[in-house]
Amino acid sequence: MNSFNYTTPDYGHYDDKDTLDLNTPVDKTSNTLRVPDILALVIFAVVFLVGVLGNALVVWVTAFEAKRTINAIWFLNLAVADFLSCLALPILFTSIVQHHHWPFGGAACSILPSLILLNMYASILLLATISADRFLLVFKPIWCQNFRGAGLAWIACAVAWGLALLLTIPSFLYRVVREEYFPPKVLCGVDYSHDKRRERAVAIVRLVLGFLWPLLTLTICYTFILLRTWSRRATRSTKTLKVVVAVVASFFIFWLPYQVTGIMMSFLEPSSPTFLLLNKLDSLCVSFAYINCCINPIIYVVAGQGFQGRLRKSLPSLLRNVLTEESVVRESKSFTRSTVDTMAQKTQAV
């Protein structure tokens, strides 16, 4: 992602010959979008519609319960992260339609694309917090009975958001607008002033902290939880656990292309064919990651329908049932109220 990770339209014969061709004029602007960009636009449109409505509904449902139900606190924070990311979509959509031209200025370039990274870090940190909560409910039920409360949950969420902001700062700082001479276009992207080491460091930190480390820890965490719950059959309800596992899985599935292409581009020269190919797929990878912003409400609804046989209740009550359920975990002779869950988010090309 050296220089700018947005590509301009192909100009066919324009830059592939060493001899002058004075008879074939080239348009100074292009009027065709690449297939990956068209797919990205379709995904963005769907994500925006589902994400805004779905997450608004989740926020509305969980906001009333967040004072007393810990599960609701988790889901509320995840929905807020997703909702914020979705708000940037119309701008990103417009930019792609205009062949990645960015007419919105420098401030918007720094803030809006960074929202998706904030969302990614907030999501994964919230998912980690929720997973830790689940782990403690299963393995330390007495501690949970004594100390686990809404206040602590809100503090954990605040810490997650704070760390997410901190991790988003590098990409925020390196985002700039550049006006290219030909084709006439203003681009919004990252510029590391040709410091490849810094660029690689940012990409590696993002991959490790936003993907590999959470993948490892969450896999271990849920392996232990599932082994315990299956072996002892001690959990009266695994509804929330199933939802959380689905959300965590979707997070990693939809973030994978963005993370892989990002790390590859940071190690490639910007003029190399592989870099240029990956660059063309950048918007598609971002849009794929953005699916995280709308997938969680879908998971909740599907889970709600599955638990209830068929959709007999209204959507809000169905969501309330999934998102604010207090599952009882039996360990030894103690009973502990528990709640758990999470959402996943995405990022945008930085």
């Epitope: 947005y6 324009y14 080239v26 100074k28």
Partner: antibody, heavy 121, light 112 residues
Framework: QVQLVQSGAEVKKPGASVKVSCKAS????????MNWVRQAPGQGLEWMGR????????KYNGKFKGRVTMTADTSTSTVYMELSSLRSEDTAVYYC??????????????WGQGTLVTVSS | DVVMTQSPLSLPVTLGEPASISCRSS???????????LHWYLQKPGQSPQLLIY???NRFSGVPDRFSGSGSGTDFTLKISRVEAEDVGVYFC?????????FGQGTKLEIK
Amino acid sequence: QVQLVQSGAEVKKPGASVKVSCKASGYAFSNSWMNWVRQAPGQGLEWMGRIYPGDGDTKYNGKFKGRVTMTADTSTSTVYMELSSLRSEDTAVYYCARFLLISTVTAVDYWGQGTLVTVSS
Amino acid sequence: DVVMTQSPLSLPVTLGEPASISCRSSQSLVHSNGNTYLHWYLQKPGQSPQLLIYKVSNRFSGVPDRFSGSGSGTDFTLKISRVEAEDVGVYFCSQSTLVPLTFGQGTKLEIK
């Protein structure tokens, strides 16, 4: 062959305006940007802006915004550069220069002979 | 704006000897399409500039093969394998990747 022929030297008073012309021949006039670059005595080159004769689209260097106007007449294959509110620092040789849009070159490839504009009271 | 810095500013060379001029940009000149729009011009005394090298290393039509260009990203070099009398003048590097187009301050090549 490509030729860019500019108008003759001008002497102007501070605060006045100057309009320099550049007549193009030997290529498809509407398919290339025309740039204006100036060079103060003993100094380097400074890009002022460009015009796309095909549709009159212009882009100016922020340093000259509000003072420079570029126009094109496709019927005579001529571009014009007008600089207003002249000051002594505007004394320079003004070049029109083609940026080729119809080949692999993608660079300013041909320059006019230059027009000396002197601003003096 | 992209600042183009040339060195040396003055280059005395013996006829037949090689010469090398360096040009450094304040930011990457790699375009989003992968090309690098860095060009070299020669302005002979009393004349308009003329294009020598375009896109880092491509010789313009009619330019002798003793002229060559190289570099990437932010660092570029123009080399003359054997300087001839007609090569005297001021050499400018220029970028057309970003707006505004910018030029180096020039390197004056003269015969010793």
